[in-house]
């Protein structure tokens, strides 16, 4: 069956060190826990997480993203899931694109993340 | 199963505070949007505002900004709606209501509401 | 703040009949629209989201349709539990808001 991919319409922001969570679904939801679920990072495809045959594929990861990332699967049977990201850091900031595999039909959706230094501030005056 | 369990029913007089509580169980509470709604006796639903309990911020409906306070304890899975300057017009049941991050795709469980009376 | 309009207010059926409720968003808000089914003393119940897909359980009776600015619900053949009234909310502003409800009744 078809389904369309929906992340988040505006930019998350993170700041340094914090983690962040990446949301994504599919429309109409339906149990996603056989397809193919991941995240990687445009223009490259550097993959940021894979999960796959009911397993997360730690194998696959780009280096910057091993035990840093997270999929949360509490919704994954109406098709929601989470990324969750440890640790942020500046190289973090910029594109993402989930995507959905059920057999050979896959939709995708591109979001944005804003990282921002904890420490920076203006002085007054 | 994800429940959805509301505070019970308040009495307050005019010009006093009322504070609602949601507790939420069976799934990952910061991850989720929790909204309160409420209907006064033989009217509509009326979203007042919510909050990303992962982001911790809330947004309020214009006509209740400065008069609502929307907040989450994560480590209690619980959410909270504080209603101060009561008035009669705010007569009615406070609902909570779950969904997806920035409060998108609806709102797929609910709270069984809690019934607000202001009189004096 | 983005107005939802229901139309009509009230409706007045029989169990067998098509039944099609309409809201207009005074905004474009794409498909980001819900449908929500309350019977008294209830809270809602979650029937449609992103105008045209079905929350799981609902029976396939309800349909969603509609983009822009005009949406639809539709019954294609009212039973006596769907007897309600029908409320539309939008989420493409994160300031939601509802239409005022459709209350369908037994002719």
């Known amino acids: 069956g078809q389904f369309r991919v929906i992340g988040p319409r505006h930019p998350i922001r993170a700041l340094v060190g914090d983690e962040v969570e990446l949301p994504c679904r599919i429309s109409p939801g339906k149990n996603a826990t056989g397809m193919e679920v991941g995240w990687y990072r445009p223009p490259f495809s550097r993959v940021v997480h894979l999960y796959r045959n009911g397993k997360d594929q730690d194998g696959d990861q780009a280096p910057e993203y091993r035990g840093r990332t997270e999929l949360l699967k509490d919704a994954i049977g109406e098709g929601k899931v989470t990324l969750r990201i440890r640790n942020v850091r500046f190289s973090d900031e910029g594109g993402f694109t989930c995507f959905f595999r059920d057999h050979s039909y896959q939709e995708e959706a591109a979001m944005e993340l804003k990282v921002e230094d904890p420490f920076y501030w203006v002085s007054p005056g | 199963q994800v429940q959805l369990v509301q505070s019970g029913a308040e009495v307050k007089k005019p010009g006093s505070s009322v504070k609602v509580s949601c507790k939420a169980s069976?799934?990952?509470?910061?991850?989720?949007?929790i909204s309160w709604v409420r209907q006064a006796p033989g009217q509509g639903l009326e979203w007042m505002g919510g909050i990303i309990p992962i982001f911790g911020t809330a947004n309020y409906a214009q006509k209740f900004q400065g008069r609502v306070t929307i907040t989450a304890d994560k480590s209690t899975s619980t959410a909270y709606m504080e209603l101060s300057s009561l008035r009669s017009e705010d007569t009615a049941v406070y609902y909570c209501a779950r969904g997806w991050y920035f409060f998108d795709a609806g709102f797929d469980y609910w709270g069984q509401g809690t019934t607000v009376t202001v009189s004096s | 703040d983005i107005q939802m309009t229901q139309s009509p207010s009230t409706l007045s059926a029989s169990v067998g009949d098509r039944v099609t409720i309409t809201c207009r968003a005074s905004q474009s808000i794409s498909s980001w629209l819900a449908w929500y089914q309350q019977k008294p003393g209830k809270a809602p119940k979650l029937l449609i989201y992103?105008?045209?897909s079905l929350e799981s359980g609902v029976p396939s009776r309800f349909s969603g349709s509609g983009s822009g600015t005009e949406f639809t619900l539709t019954i294609s053949s009212l039973q006596p539990d769907d007897f309600a009234t029908y409320y539309c909310?939008?989420?493409?502003?994160?300031?939601?808001?509802f239409g005022q409800g459709t209350k369908v009744e037994i002719k």
């Open positions: 909310q939008q989420y493409d502003s994160p300031l939601l808001t």
């Open positions: 992103d105008a045209s």
């Open positions: 069976g799934g990952t509470f910061s991850s989720y949007a």
